[in-house]
Amino acid sequence: EPPTACREKQYLINSQCCSLCQPGQKLVSDCTEFTETECLPCSESEFLDTWNRETRCHQHKYCDPNLGLQVQQKGTSETDTICTCEEGLHCTSESCESCVPHRSCLPGFGVKQIATGVSDTICEPCPVGFFSNVSSAFEKCRPWTSCETKDLVVQQAGTNKTDVVCGPQDRQRA
């Protein structure tokens, strides 16, 4: 009765358990009773990242500059190229096939987390006591000016988009 299963680094072919090819190599010919599996290294622009029986290696990913992509890590025979986005851009998906500009936080919102090559800007509404009057991908909400520390009084209350306006204290006449 021929085998129906093989060990993990083997594969079943013609009632035989043959050795899989190591990462970085592709299958040229299956084993026989008397010859081992024949494998060949992937070429410079290709890779295979698992023990395999593939007859073709996979092409390395191309980081297309027209899509805002650049190489983060060059591929090897065992690993794919890793792309990232140019400055000011981030990936649209986990596989990073294209890039879009980082979003800016509108007035009334500040930057909670600055964007990276793989994640967009995270904005948060400015809480009471803070404001942002600019559209920015970097600026956090800033605290309202403290009039008291300048020996001034609030003449105009602040909002999430504007700072308070300070003015001199009214002097009472004798």
């Epitope: 085998p3 299963a5 993990e8 680094k9 358990c17 190591q22 026989t32 008397f34 599996t37 494998c39």
Partner: antibody, heavy 127, light 107 residues
Framework: EVQLLESGGGLVRPGGSLRLSCAAS????????MNWVRQAPGKGLEWVSY????????DYADSVKGRFTVSRDNSKNLLYLQMNSLRAEDTAVYYC????????????????????WGQGTMVTVSS | DIQLTQSPSSLTASVGDRVTITCRSS??????LAWYQQKPGKPPKLLIY???SLEGGVPSRFSGSGSGTDFTLTISSLQPEDFATYYC?????????FGQGTKLEIK
């Protein structure tokens, strides 16, 4: 220290059942394929069963197929052999053994061997 | 199933002797063969894997050769601790099988 320790052996009547356990320590159990091998008194070694690292693939010697079931619990580092419909000819010392894949990246193909064995547990099937 | 036949079944030799044990497979198994040493009351110990690769910590007096159907285990100069039973095993395909063993005794 890398170790395997079998337990659960004993005397059982023909037709009875027994569950053997093998506790692994000193290595990442869930990364290794495992085997049960037995040795009848005064006889040679007989491979009994195999289980892949995930437990997805199993295989058995013809002499135990349909009666024995191998399983594993990687969270507890335990290997099991459930033995049903036991016969007198199942009397043996039962060893659990670790399958290892030896591989040198400069070489063409790797090779398997059983590099770690337990001390064994005796199973006697008798009326 | 693949059958493995070891010869001789038993062998008497002296310390310092060169000893060869053979293992023949009923079908080609390339180099998917391992050799084990077993002493009474103890589990087997892996000596050779892949027909000719020495397991770590095994003395260099042990060597393995062969491919396809014919394999040999050689002990170049027997030491007192080498008297034991030796088994070959094919790991080419399931069911995995062992040879019947070769008992090496002191003369």
């Amino acid at each position: 220290e890398v170790q395997l320790l079998e337990s659960g052996g004993g005397l059982v009547r023909p037709g009875g059942s027994l569950r053997l356990s093998c506790a692994a320590s000193g290595f990442t159990f869930g990364s290794y394929e495992m085997n049960w091998v037995r040795q009848a008194p005064g006889k040679g070694l007989e491979w009994v069963s195999y289980i892949s690292s995930s437990g997805e693939t199993t295989d058995y010697a013809d002499s135990v197929k349909g009666r024995f079931t191998v399983s594993r619990d990687n969270s507890k580092n335990l290997l099991y052999l459930q033995m049903n419909s036991l016969r007198a000819e199942d009397t043996a010392v039962y060893y659990c053994a670790r399958d290892v894949f030896f591989f040198d990246s400069s070489g063409d193909n790797g090779a398997y061997g059983m590099d770690v064995w337990g001390q064994g547990t005796m199973v006697t099937v008798s009326s | 199933d693949i059958q493995l036949t070891q010869s001789p079944s038993s062998l008497t030799a002296s310390v310092g002797d060169r000893v060869t044990i053979t293992c023949r497979s009923s079908q080609g198994i390339r180099s998917s063969l391992a050799w084990y040493q077993q002493k009474p009351g103890k589990p087997p110990k892996l000596l050779i894997y892949g027909a000719s690769s020495l397991e770590g910590g095994v003395p260099s007096r042990f060597s393995g050769s062969g491919s396809g159907t014919d394999f040999t285990l050689t002990i170049s100069s027997l030491q007192p601790e080498d008297f034991a039973t030796y088994y070959c095993q094919q790991l080419n395909s399931f069911p995995s099988t062992f040879g019947q063993g070769t008992k090496l005794e002191i003369k």
